[in-house]
Each structure stands twice: as structure tokens, then as C-alpha cells.
Interface confidence: medium
């Protein structure tokens, strides 16, 4: 798709279900975080905002479960299985997605559209 | 075969609360989630919300957090929805439906529903 | 929210003809899973909605083969090979890609 100048730029909130990957004793989701509110924001790449302290995805394993379900680097993650992530530290949120009762994580993230992602790509 | 039966009609005076109840056949309940569905006579319908039972997680339209709230009896197969502080502005029809999965390879979002509750709210 | 427009929002067919219902939404509704979670439901007067059409064009158990679904990105149809008097009543175009999910207005599809 191609950036057309003036569409309106809009950031989806997606559901995305990631079943986890037993590998012996773990359970492997695939992707990792950056961020929370004991973290420093401005050393985050992915948002725009320099005081969000919300929680990214900045890693995502190739052909993993979370790439699988569709997570994508750069999305921000609101809530883990209805629990709120915006207001979280790096640990509680990495708890969060860990816990080993829950073989299925349901992420609710928001993410850049296709737009605005070309949209940067142009400008850079 | 799976079958969703809801509870009757109800009639209620605005600033009350009601509960209203989805019962589960025919499939294994904590499988799959229910969801929530309005109905405003002679408009179109509108996800409320709904809850996986055997996790409890529930995922609500923003819409609706303060209005409604899910909860599931795993032992009777039943999903319930209390609606609170009511107006006559939530006079409608509420349909539960099975929700699945994006993982799900057979059949939509919502597979089978049930036959609808309708509610009154009155003075 | 992604708004889910259908068109036309009365359609009067004669028995055996042909229908043909479209639905846009406001923005793309492919999933980042790639799926396109968008679907057909029709209600039926007095009954509960009952599912035609998942992932934009696999009918679902039962139904008849005359109903078929197409489209992508976000321009989608609904149509009806030989329209039959059971087929009567109000077609919902859906999408579960985007939080929260939501239905079309609906559309009437009536004797002529």
C-alpha cells in the first residue's frame, strides 16, 4: 500500500491471541518487552510520546507463537488477559505474560497503521 | 447440539439492576466465550462485551464497561450479565452468542446464539 | 471504532432473482495475523441472528451454497445466487479484527 499524502493517519487496537509453546518445563511466547513506569521513556524508539511508560514490543522471534498470532515490533500493549498494562512496571507486566497457568495470552495492543508506518519510512 | 438458553423477559424500574442469565448445552463451556450482543428495537446490533469461563477474563466495549458486568458459573454451564443503574435508554433485546477464538478454524465469532432476553426498563 | 457501512439498507428481490449486499469499513480489516475476521449474519423476523459467512467468504455449517462472500481490505460483498422465501429478513456484515468489534447497520432484504 502506498502512502497517499493527507490520508488520515490512524492507530488500530487489535486482539491477539498467542498460544504458548511448551518447551519442557517453560512455556515460550516468543517476543519480548521494553518499557514500564520504572523504566526510563525517552529510551524507548517505539513511541512517540517521550513520557510513555507504556509497555512495547521490541522483540518478536521469528516463527514463534507470538509472530504467528500476529504481534508485531512496535506494538503497545494495554492489557494482558483484561488486566491493565499501562500503568505497570517492566517486572509486573513481564509476570503478567508469564504466568505459567495461562497457556493462552490474550493481548490487547495498538499499533501504528500501515499509513503511518510508510508515512515515517518516507520521511527518513 | 449446541444450544444457549436465556432467561425471560424482564421488567425493571429505572435506577435498579438485573441480571440476566445464558445457560450452556451441548458443548464444554469453559471451550469457548460468550459474548454479549444489544439489540434496540428496530436498530442494529452491538457487542457489549463478553467472558472467557474458564479463566474468568472478561473484554468489554468501552461503551459498556460501566454498564454491564460479566461473570460465568462454571458448575451450572451458565454465563450471567447484570446491567446496572438502568434508564430507559437500556430498554433493548440482549442476546448472548458463543464466541471463539481467532484460532478457531471452524465457524465465526459468534457460531450460535441464544434466543434473546427482552428487558423493560419502566417507571 | 471501525464503522461498518452497508449498503443498500432495503433491498426488494423477487423469488429466484439474484441479491447482492455490500459492506465497507471505515479502515483496513485485515488482522496482524493476516486473517480477515470479517462476517455475515442474518436475522430472521422475531428470531436471533444466525451465521452465514466467516473470513470473508467460507460459509458456514449448513448453509446453503448459494450464499457466497467476497472482498478484501475493506470493501466486501454478500451475495445471493436464487433468492428463496426463507432468505427474507435483516443480513448484518461484521468484523472481529479490530477492538471492540462491530456490525453493520443491517440490510432488509424484502419481497418486491
Known amino acids: 500500500m502506498s502512502y497517499i499524502p493527507g490520508q488520515p493517519v490512524t492507530a488500530v487496537v487489535q486482539r491477539v491471541e498467542i498460544h504458548k509453546l511448551r518447551q519442557g518445563e517453560n512455556l515460550i511466547l516468543g517476543f519480548s518487552i521494553g518499557g514500564g513506569i520504572d523504566q526510563d521513556p525517552s529510551q524507548n524508539p517505539f513511541s512517540e510520546d517521550k513520557t510513555d511508560k507504556g509497555i512495547y514490543v521490541t522483540r518478536v522471534s521469528e516463527g514463534g507463537p507470538a509472530e504467528i498470532a500476529g504481534l508485531q515490533i512496535g506494538d503497545k500493549i494495554m492489557q494482558v488477559n483484561g488486566w491493565d498494562m499501562t500503568m505497570v512496571t517492566h517486572d509486573q507486566a513481564r509476570k503478567r505474560l508469564t504466568k505459567r497457568s495461562e497457556e493462552v495470552v490474550r493481548l490487547l495492543v495498538t499499533r501504528q497503521s500501515l499509513q503511518k508506518a510508510v508515512q515515517q519510512s518516507m520521511l527518513s | 447440539q449446541v444450544q444457549l438458553q436465556q432467561s425471560g423477559a424482564e421488567l425493571a424500574r429505572p435506577g435498579a439492576s438485573v441480571k440476566l442469565s445464558c445457560k450452556a448445552s451441548?458443548?464444554?463451556?469453559?471451550?469457548?466465550?460468550i459474548s454479549w450482543v444489544i439489540q434496540k428495537t428496530g436498530q442494529g446490533l452491538e457487542w457489549i462485551g463478553e467472558?472467557?469461563?474458564?479463566?474468568?477474563?472478561?473484554y468489554y466495549n468501552e461503551k459498556f464497561k460501566a454498564k454491564a458486568a460479566l461473570t460465568a458459573d462454571k458448575s451450572s454451564s451458565t454465563a450471567h450479565m447484570e446491567l446496572r443503574s438502568l434508564t430507559s435508554e437500556d430498554s433493548a433485546v440482549y442476546f448472548c452468542?458463543?464466541?471463539?477464538?481467532?484460532?478457531?478454524?471452524?465457524?465465526?465469532?459468534?457460531?450460535?446464539w441464544g434466543q434473546g432476553t427482552p428487558l423493560t426498563v419502566s417507571s | 471504532d471501525v464503522l461498518m457501512t452497508q449498503t443498500p439498507l432495503s433491498l426488494p428481490v423477487s423469488l429466484g432473482d439474484q441479491a447482492s449486499i455490500s459492506c465497507r469499513s471505515s479502515?483496513?480489516?485485515?488482522?496482524?495475523?493476516?486473517?480477515?475476521?470479517l462476517e455475515w449474519y442474518l436475522q430472521k423476523p422475531g428470531q436471533s441472528p444466525k451465521l452465514l459467512i466467516h473470513?470473508?467468504?467460507n460459509r458456514f455449517s449448513g448453509v446453503p451454497d448459494r450464499f457466497s462472500g467476497s472482498g478484501s481490505g475493506t470493501d466486501f460483498t454478500l451475495k445471493i445466487s436464487r433468492v428463496e422465501a426463507e432468505d427474507l429478513g435483516v443480513y448484518y456484515c461484521?468484523?472481529?479484527?479490530?477492538?471492540?468489534?462491530?456490525f453493520g447497520g443491517g440490510t432488509k432484504l424484502e419481497i418486491k
Open positions: 452468542a458463543r464466541s471463539k477464538t481467532y484460532y478457531s478454524k471452524y465457524g465465526g465469532f459468534f457460531d450460535y
Open positions: 451441548g458443548y464444554t463451556f469453559t471451550s469457548s466465550g
Open positions: 467472558i472467557y469461563p474458564r479463566s474468568g477474563n472478561t
Open positions: 479502515q483496513s480489516i485485515v488482522h496482524g495475523n493476516g486473517n480477515t475476521y
Open positions: 473470513k470473508v467468504s
Open positions: 461484521f468484523q472481529g479484527s479490530h477492538v471492540p468489534p462491530t
